[in-house]
Each structure stands twice: as C-alpha cells, then as structure tokens.
C-alpha cells in the first residue's frame, strides 16, 4: 500500500491521543536503556510503511503484536485516514486471525514495540528536507536542512 495520500495530521492526532499511551502501557516495566532503535524512516509515507510492517507482520520471536490494543487502533486509524487502505488489508486480516492463538509478551516483542515508538517519533516530527514533499506542502522550499 502507498501511504502517500494519507491524512498525516489526523493519524498523528490518533497516535498522540491513544496509540502512544497503549504503546507505553505495553512497554511498562522495561528499562529505557534496554533497546537501541535500528529501524528508521525517511519520510511520513515511509514511516507508515515501516510502522505497518512492524505492527502487523509476524516476525521471528514475536508473532502476536497484531492483536494488541495499539495495533487494533493503528489499523483503525490507517483504515479511516488512508484512502483505500482497508481494501488492501483483507488478506492481512486472514493472516492475523491465524496468528491469534497466544498472546505472549516476549523480549523480542518489547524490542519491536520500542522500534515502533521510534518510528512514530519520526512520523510525528520529520527532521529533514527530503521528508517534506508529501508532509510540508505549503512552505517546504523555505526550509534549509542539512544532511551529513
């Protein structure tokens, strides 16, 4: 799915009002120094692509995130604010149902959610000019950004 045409401000609002708090709840009891963010994103559509992948795709050692509260709210936000997103997710929903057997919080899942928090931070506040084309429509060329 191409996230370019999503309403980023509405998704950001949904994240800050509820999803962020659910992620914090999931991570509660985990030391803030425990995980190093290794997944990054370069613009808002890219951030949403990475967020979708980490939230809904089962990975080795963490198969169960898709049924967590933050994941369901993420799915709802994307369905509402990304045109045509719901239609692309029918097959993914079937895969999710198959993964619904056990709800276990593993260290790998905690690490994955830590990565998600980092991706959401960059979605909320893109840093560089190359992130601007779809994010900052009206004054992007007034920004002077430096990339090292």
């Amino acid at each position: 799915y191409d996230f370019t045409n999503c309403d980023f401000e509405k998704i950001k609002a949904a994240y800050l009002s509820t999803i962020s708090k659910d992620l914090i709840t999931y991570m509660s009891g985990t030391k803030s120094t425990e995980f190093n963010n290794t997944v990054s994103c370069s613009n808002r559509p890219h951030c949403l692509t990475e967020i979708q992948s980490l939230t809904f795709n089962p990975t080795a050692g963490c198969a169960s995130l898709a049924k967590e509260m933050f994941a369901m709210k993420t799915k709802a936000a994307l369905a509402i604010w990304c045109p045509g997103y719901s239609e692309t997710q029918i097959n993914a929903t079937q895969a999710m149902k198959k993964a619904r057997k056990s709800k276990v919080t593993t260290n790998k899942c905690l690490e994955q959610v830590s990565q998600l928090q980092g991706l959401w931070r960059r979605f909320n506040r893109p840093l560089l000019k190359q992130q601007g084309s779809s994010d900052y429509k009206d004054d992007d060329d007034k920004h002077h950004h430096h990339h090292h």
Epitope: E9, A13, Y15, L16, S20, I24, S32, T33, E34, F35, N36, N37, S40, S114, Q117, G118, W120, R121, R122, F123, N124, R125, L127, L128, Y136, D139, H143, H145, H146, H147, H148
Partner: antibody
C-alpha cells in the same frame, strides 16, 4: 532517570568560537533527538538546531547564518553545539534538551551553560 | 518563520483564581503546540504537549486548548508555586519558534 549534564560556563572574545557539551545518561542516547535552545539575559527562548544522534542528521535555524554546528558522539552519549564568529549578542544561557517519547516536545533539559562574549 | 505571539506579556492573578495565557501563531500550526514553564534560575519544564496533553506529573489545574492559530494555557486555580514565565512553542515547521513568554505573578 534521564539526565543531561552540560559543560561549564565560558567567557569568550568576539570573533572566537565556543563549543558546549551535553552528556546524556539514563536513556538510549541514539534513540532521541537532541535540541539546542538559547536564552539571552532577561529574554525568551530561541531554538538553534537539532541532531538525530542515531544517524547524525541535523537541522539548523538559518537565523544563525551557518554559525552553528551540532554534532554527537554515540560512544560517549554526548552532543555538542559549536557557535562561531561570536559577538556580544551571543551572550546567553545555552540549553540542550531531549525530545519526549512522542517526538512532539522537549521533556528533559540540561542545566544550561552560560556563555559570555566580551572583549 | 512562524511567529508565536503571547498575550499578555505579564499577568497578576490572586491565589486560587484562574489564569489564562494566550498564544497566537502567524500561520496555522495545526495542533503542534507545546507549553513550558520556567522558574527563575531554572531550565524550562514541559507542561503540555500537542495542545492539550499533560506531561507526566503535571497537575490537572494546567490545561491547554486551541488549534490552527489560536491557543490557550489555563491554570484553573493559581498556586504559589505556579509563579513563573510560561512559553508556547510550535514544532509544525522549521525553525521551531517560541512565544516571547508571559510572566505570571501573584496579585
């Protein structure tokens, strides 16, 4: 508990440079943006720039006309702000701050470093 | 640059009374507004992020509202420890900019 500890006060001559350090502890340094903000005596807050220590991407306030350079050393969890071509108007308290968990605010601040520019 | 203009510059309110500080942006900043409190000789402290969200440990008497260009910080019942300078900040566009500050005192 996250802590940002800054280097000590500096007195500098006009035209010289100053480099202020900001050492982070209690969190994963490379996961959060580090901001630099200054405050002239009796004045408000002025944002200078930001660095992502994870990939050293930066963004500067162009009002400083290229005089600001922000760097980070992951091995020591330390960010640096260097300001060149100093003038008397640069006399201020310089703060480093860390972005919060949502990326929408600065939740931890250093204690501030006083830089005095005087001939 | 987006200019953030606070009003009033200073405000004197009686203990237990309501204090209201306004912040106006020169162009829309959506909901990307943060409020900070700074006491004399101290670093700023985060109070409210994304217009109305309380930072951890901030008392309920502080609240934020607004969207677009007009924002308000309200202290419902002023306490002695609330004497400080309050700043709004936008993070919608680079460079990030702050209001000039509002000094809150006890009447």
């Amino acid at each position: 508990e996250v802590q940002l500890v800054q280097s000590g006060a500096e007195v500098k001559k006009p035209g010289s440079s100053v480099k202020v350090s900001c050492k982070a502890s209690g969190g994963t340094f490379s996961n959060y943006l580090i901001e630099w903000v200054r405050q002239a005596p009796g004045q408000g807050l002025e944002w200078m720039g930001v660095i992502d220590p994870g990939n050293v991407d930066t963004n500067y306030n162009e009002n400083f006309k290229g005089r600001v350079t922000i760097t980070a050393d992951k091995s020591t969890s330390t960010a640096y702000m260097e300001l060149s071509s100093l003038r008397s108007e640069d006399t201020a308290v310089y703060y480093c701050a860390r972005e919060d968990n949502t990326g929408t605010a600065f939740d931890y601040w250093g204690q501030g470093t006083t830089v005095t520019v005087s001939s | 640059d987006i200019v953030m203009t606070q009003s009033p510059d200073s405000l004197a309110v009686s203990l237990g009374e309501r204090a209201t500080i306004n912040c106006k942006a020169s162009q829309s900043v959506s909901s990307d507004v943060t409020w900070y409190q700074q006491k004399p000789g101290q670093s700023p402290k985060l109070l409210i992020y994304y217009v109305s969200n309380h930072y951890t440990g901030v008392p309920d008497r502080f609240s934020g509202s607004g969207s677009g260009t007009d924002f308000t910080l309200t202290i419902s019942s002023l306490q002695a420890e609330d004497v400080a300078v309050y700043y709004c900040q936008q993070h919608h566009r680079f460079p990030l900019t702050f209001g000039q500050g509002t000094k809150l005192e006890i009447k």
